[in-house]
């Protein structure tokens, strides 16, 4: 065509796949009458008529564009819907009068690829490979045009490097005309790359500008020989008996060698292999002081049969031995003194505490508890706690019962019990003393005795309420070798006029007696022996 070399560059129209391209015929009125225009698509320099405009009315020509073209803007613009990659070509409009002129439009089509999918080489890479090995593959699907790929290691872009880095990219065209890009990164890796993060980046263009998408970061298994093995103990810090302790072998090679853990026999000085779990971990649960000792780990490379030995590690399981208290079962008179001595062994410095068992009160900080001018109330439990202050939770205790000789001491002397005739009454009577008293009742019934502690006894009596019983009342008598003591239970009939018993009485029906009153400890400092009996 004469003068074609002087044709201006076509107007560029950019559009995304699936959207509508607006092809505006740029002929001026002088160049042609827009009410009489032919539209052509140009593919491989071949023109194909695709649309006619006559008297401002448009008509599609049969063919691939038949259903997708329409006229807009009073005939000046041709709209192409559902744009595909195959639509990337030149479109031209040709005016017929006054003379034949044409206007060219270059349609550029774009489609963002999907998120890049990265797959690491699952087999891993040995560090001593002679040539670059496949590290990972990056796939970017359904993009248009073909996106560019950039590989990164630890955030830095990788460039082709002879015998070290090679990037091999290929693409396939889908039936949709979209491209799928596949890029394989090959590299020679070193031991330090075991933690390296690799990812790929797809660079592509849209009508709005340049864009990029990044894959997730991956690490590749890197195989390298073991140079060193060592032991690791968990938990870190001071260990104590009862802890769960894990001893594991570690190596700086990948894959790790076959491990075995040995402990030195203190008698023979020989290393004896310990039994580990399926993960090669020696679990000491609960740890005991006997677990203390020298441990070492052997790593055997099953390929090369090279064996490596760790530095030995001393394990100390801190302990507190059984606590011994002397005297073990002290019996003392009122007014006498008692020295309780606590002993224990430990792998660390021990702290001793004496506590009153009943109250938890700390009486002494130290192994020796001295009790002077003992009163009956001093009888009971004393607990020695041997603890290691530097290791929280490491302690052992021993309870010792101090018996103070004395006749029976009644929990109450007198009590009123409200009853109904012919009911079965459950009465209780409590006494303490040393030797421990026995309790007898002055009425027939089913009695049972329960030892509350070494100095205290509780007797329970089930008895039928009869007129005779109401008259006589009930007495319980506690006795030991040092004396006798009696508690009296007055039985009173409940009747309609009995509303609230006076505040000094204890009410009760079928299970009548409330728990016995407790006697407050004497704080008297009078210089005399205690009362001969306590009547509750």
């Amino acid at each position: 065509v004469p003068g074609e070399a002087e044709q201006p560059a076509p107007e560029l129209v950019e559009v995304e796949v699936g959207s509508t391209a607006l092809l505006k015929c740029g002929l001026s009125q002088s160049q042609g009458n827009l009410s009489h225009v032919d539209w052509f698509s140009v593919h491989k320099e071949k023109r194909t008529l695709i649309f006619r405009v006559r008297q401002g009315q448009g008509q599609s020509e049969p063919g691939e564009y038949e259903q997708r073209l329409s006229l807009q803007d009073r005939g000046a613009t041709l709209a192409l819907t559902q744009v595909t990659p195959q639509d990337e070509r030149i479109f031209l409009c040709q005016g017929k009068r006054p003379r034949s002129q044409e206007y060219r439009i270059q349609l550029r089509v774009y489609k963002a690829p999907e998120e890049p999918n990265i797959q690491v080489n699952p087999l891993g890479i040995p560090v001593n490979s002679k040539e670059p090995e496949e590290v990972a593959t990056c796939v970017g699907r359904n993009g248009y045009p073909i996106p560019q790929v950039i590989w990164y290691k630890n955030g830095r872009p990788l460039k082709e490097e002879k015998n070290r880095v090679h990037i091999q990219s290929s693409q396939t065209v889908e039936s949709s005309g979209l491209y799928t890009l596949q890029s394989i990164l090959k590299a020679q890796l070193v031991k330090e790359d075991k933690d390296a993060q690799f990812y790929c980046e797809l660079n592509y263009r849209l009508p709005s500008g340049n864009h990029m998408k990044e894959s997730r970061e991956v690490t590749v298994p890197v195989f390298y020989p073991t140079e060193k093995v060592w032991l690791e103990v968990e938990p870190v810090g001071m260990l104590k008996e009862g802890d769960r302790v894990e001893i594991r072998c570690l190596a700086d090679g990948n894959p790790p060698p076959h491990f075995s853990i040995s402990k030195q026999n203190p008698s023979t000085r020989e290393a004896e292999e310990e039994t580990t779990n399926d993960n090669g971990v020696l679990v000491l649960e609960p740890a005991r002081k006997e677990h203390s000792g020298r441990y070492e780990c052997q790593g055997l490379d099953l390929d090369t049969m090279i064996s490596l030995l760790s530095e030995p590690q001393e394990l100390l399981v801190n302990y507190v031995s059984d606590v011994r208290v002397s005297p073990a079962a002290p019996e003392r008179q009122e007014g006498s003194s008692l020295t309780l001595t606590c002993e224990a062994e430990s792998s660390q410095d021990l702290e001793f505490q004496w506590l009153r068992e009943e109250t938890g009160q700390v009486l002494e900080r130290g192994p020796v508890l001295q009790l002077h001018d003992l009163k009956r109330e001093a009888g009971g439990g004393y607990r020695c706690v041997a603890s290691v202050p530097s290791i929280p939770g490491l302690n052992r205790t021993q309870l010792v019962n101090v018996a103070i000789f004395g006749p029976p001491w009644m929990a109450f002397k007198e009590r009123k019990v409200w009853v109904k005739e012919n009911m079965v009454l459950n009465l209780s009577c409590e006494a303490s003393g040393h030797p421990r008293p026995t309790i007898s009742w002055n009425v027939n019934g089913t009695a049972s005795e329960q030892d509350q502690d070494p100095q205290r006894v509780l007797s329970t009596l089930n008895v039928l309420v009869t007129p005779e019983l109401l008259e006589t009342g009930v007495e319980c008598t506690a006795s030991n070798d040092l004396g006798k003591n009696t508690s009296i239970l007055f039985l009173e009939l409940v009747n309609l006029t009995t509303l609230t018993p006076d505040s000094n009485t204890t009410t009760g029906l079928s299970t009548s007696t409330a728990s016995p009153h407790t006697r407050a400890n004497s704080t008297s400092t009078e210089r005399k022996l205690p009362e001969p009996e306590s009547r509750g």
């Epitope: 008179q333 007014g335 003194s337 004395g406 006749p407 040092l482 205690p530 001969p532 009996e533």
Partner: antibody
Framework: QVQLVESGGSLVQPGGSLRLSCEAS????????MSWVRQAPGKGLEWVSI????????SYADSVKGRFTISRDSSKNMLYLQMNSLRAEDTAVYYC????????????WGQGTLVTVSS | FMLTQDPAVSVALGQTVRITCQGD??????ASWYQQKPGQSPVLVIY???NRPSGIPDRFSGSSSGNTASLTITGAQAEDEADYYC?????????????FGTGTKLTVL
């Protein structure tokens, strides 16, 4: 074995003073209350005084209260009875006795020492 | 307070004899019993409910009822001839006092 040996008995004038001693051996002295018991010639036994194992508590029969003082030295395993303002009716053999429980009984007795109050 | 004993009791050799002791304190405390032979120190023979110190023959036994304590010798022997004293804590005072019984002279015939 348990042994109690009294000493210090003698003839003393009325109104005079005397100190009796009792040496204990064969047991943990500080763990036991100790008593003095006396027996006038041809008469029965009469309890005189008691002291607790620690020495912190004492008690006396009405007949000697205010005149006699009981004490002990556990470091020396010794029991003492300081007798002041002695009277003729204090004449007796004085025994020291160990109290088994602090509540009775007297399970070991010394051989006794004679105190005579006479002008 | 007082613990009262019979001044004298006699028993035929091999027979059983009971020596009694009465007093209010015996409602709360058991009596202890002591044997004293002429020129000797007293010896504990029974204490508590019915306990014998080692070395005391089992013919000696004790019992208690109400305000009365008893020492029983079953099959009395000649060597049992002695003075016998009961002893108890005083339950009337607010601090410990001990009291001895008046004593019983046992003669074995």
């Amino acid at each position: 074995q348990v042994q109690l040996v009294e000493s210090g008995g003698s003839l003393v004038q009325p109104g005079g003073s005397l100190r009796l001693s009792c040496e204990a051996s064969g047991f943990t002295f500080s763990s036991y209350a100790m008593s003095w018991v006396r027996q006038a010639p041809g008469k029965g036994l009469e309890w005189v005084s008691i002291i607790s194992g620690s020495g912190g508590s004492t008690s006396y029969a009405d007949s000697v209260k205010g005149r006699f003082t009981i004490s002990r030295d556990s470091s020396k395993n010794m029991l003492y009875l300081q007798m002041n303002s002695l009277r003729a009716e204090d004449t007796a053999v004085y025994y020291c006795a160990r109290d088994k429980y602090g509540y009775n009984p007297f399970d070991y007795w010394g051989q006794g020492t004679l105190v005579t109050v006479s002008s | 307070f007082m613990l009262t004993q019979d001044p004298a009791v006699s028993v035929a050799l091999g027979q059983t004899v009971r020596i009694t002791c009465q007093g209010d304190s015996l409602r709360s405390y058991y009596a202890s019993w002591y044997q004293q032979k002429p020129g000797q120190s007293p010896v504990l023979v029974i204490y508590g409910k019915n306990n014998r110190p080692s070395g005391i023959p089992d013919r000696f036994s004790g019992s208690s009822s109400g305000n009365t304590a008893s020492l029983t010798i079953t099959g009395a022997q000649a060597e049992d001839e002695a003075d016998y004293y009961c002893n108890s804590r005083d339950s009337s005072g607010n601090h410990p006092l001990y009291v001895f019984g008046t004593g019983t002279k046992l003669t074995v015939l």
